[in-house]
């Protein structure tokens, strides 16, 4: 039975040209995290493999930095970066846990971080 939950930074906003940290945290499970994948809609941004470390997609290397921790830092933000981001935790023996973050990139300086909140996680077994 999968008991884990993912807490994320939730709905967040940031200024065009700035940076933002995407963070997820998996709790309430003793499952071993084997890999965390970060995805934006239908594109893989980065992988953090427990054995092999961080690997950033070649097409995002200039704008994506690993960390802090298992999080991901997006740099030089554009309005096109607005959208859904997913942290996908591959675990053993539980399977896969997925967290969702919505990022809005704003033209002006009205950007604020949304409060941290826990989202319902969806998951599937391998």
């Amino acid at each position: 039975m999968m008991t884990g939950t993912i807490e994320t930074t939730g709905n967040i906003s940031a200024e065009k040209g700035g940076s933002i940290i995407l963070q997820c945290h998996l709790s309430s499970t003793t499952a071993q995290v084997t890999q965390v994948n970060w995805e934006q809609q239908d594109q893989l941004l980065a992988i953090c493999n427990a054995d092999l470390g961080w690997h950033i997609s070649p097409s995002f290397k200039d704008r994506v930095a690993p960390g802090p921790g298992l999080g991901l830092t997006l740099q030089s933000l554009t309005v096109n970066d607005t959208g859904e981001y997913f942290c996908i935790y591959h675990t053993y023996p539980d399977g896969t846990y997925t967290g969702r973050i919505f990022l809005e990139v704003l033209e002006s300086s009205v950007a604020e971080h949304g409060a941290r909140f826990q989202i319902p996680h969806h998951h599937h077994h391998h």
Partner: antibody, heavy 117, light 107 residues
Framework: EVQLVQSGAEVKKPGASVKVSCKAS????????IEWVRQAPGQRLEWMGV????????NYKEKFKGRVTITADKSSSTAYMELSSLRSEDTAVYYC??????????WGQGTTVTVSS | DIVMTQSPDSLAVSLGERATINCKAS??????VAWYQHKPGQSPKLLIY???YRYTGVPDRFSGSGSGTDFTLTISSLQAEDVAVYYC?????????FGGGTKVEIK
């Protein structure tokens, strides 16, 4: 020019071990993964495992765990794949490849390993 | 493990015609798919990574598309030197599994 040069063909008896080397040149050895892939006659390519030469971290396909050991010597920019308890089904061409974000952009020339009594 | 199923197993296409190879992943792999060309007696060569990014030096007649579970490699105008076996591979999660291969021949 990036190059991966593998050791020569081997003929082994069942139960023996084989160690294949892969010497890298033309790039920073510790900045990329080294992956090992094999192809048995008439079969698809099969991923065996990978090493991060910078950290020494490894990851193996479950079916090879306990039988395969992948190592890397930073001083000579050489990776090694040792497969033990050989059986006839291990007869294959073994390739090393440079891993960039878990796809393989440069490949060695392949090493034929024949297991026969 | 993620299973990559390629179709068709073999394909005969006239010179200058289009060749299309499909690959289906048993579960979501985002755009984490690469395509390789493998000729007899040679090492495989990377053609496409991250589903649609053409690798350096690869002719633009090769293109890739897809995301999630369904992926396609297209050779827009088949040349004699394209006769080979083509493999898809998922680079989304370990173990990095390959498809069964598609043999492309001249009709």
């Amino acid at each position: 020019e990036v190059q991966l040069v593998q050791s020569g063909a081997e003929v082994k008896k069942p139960g023996a071990s084989v160690k294949v080397s892969c010497k890298a040149s033309g790039y920073a050895f510790t900045n990329y993964l080294i992956e090992w892939v094999r192809q048995a006659p008439g079969q698809r390519l099969e991923w065996m495992g990978v090493i991060n030469p910078g950290s020494g971290g490894t990851n193996y396909k479950e079916k090879f765990k306990g039988r395969v050991t992948i190592t890397a010597d930073k001083s000579s920019s050489t990776a090694y794949m040792e497969l033990s308890s050989l059986r006839s089904e291990d007869t294959a061409v073994y390739y090393c490849a440079r891993g960039e974000y878990f796809f393989f952009d440069y490949w060695g020339q392949g090493t034929t390993v024949t297991v026969s009594s | 493990d993620i299973v990559m199923t390629q179709s068709p197993d073999s394909l005969a296409v006239s010179l200058g015609e289009r060749a299309t190879i499909n690959c289906k992943a048993s579960q979501h792999v985002s755009n984490g798919v690469a395509w390789y060309q493998h000729k007899p007696g040679q090492s495989p060569k990377l053609l496409i990574y991250s589903a649609s990014y053409r690798y350096t030096g690869v002719p633009d007649r090769f293109s890739g598309s897809g995301s999630g579970t369904d992926f396609t490699l297209t050779i827009s105008s088949l040349q004699a030197e394209d006769v080979a076996v083509y493999y898809c591979q998922q680079h989304y999660n370990t173990p990095h599994t390959f498809g069964g291969g598609t043999k492309v021949e001249i009709k």
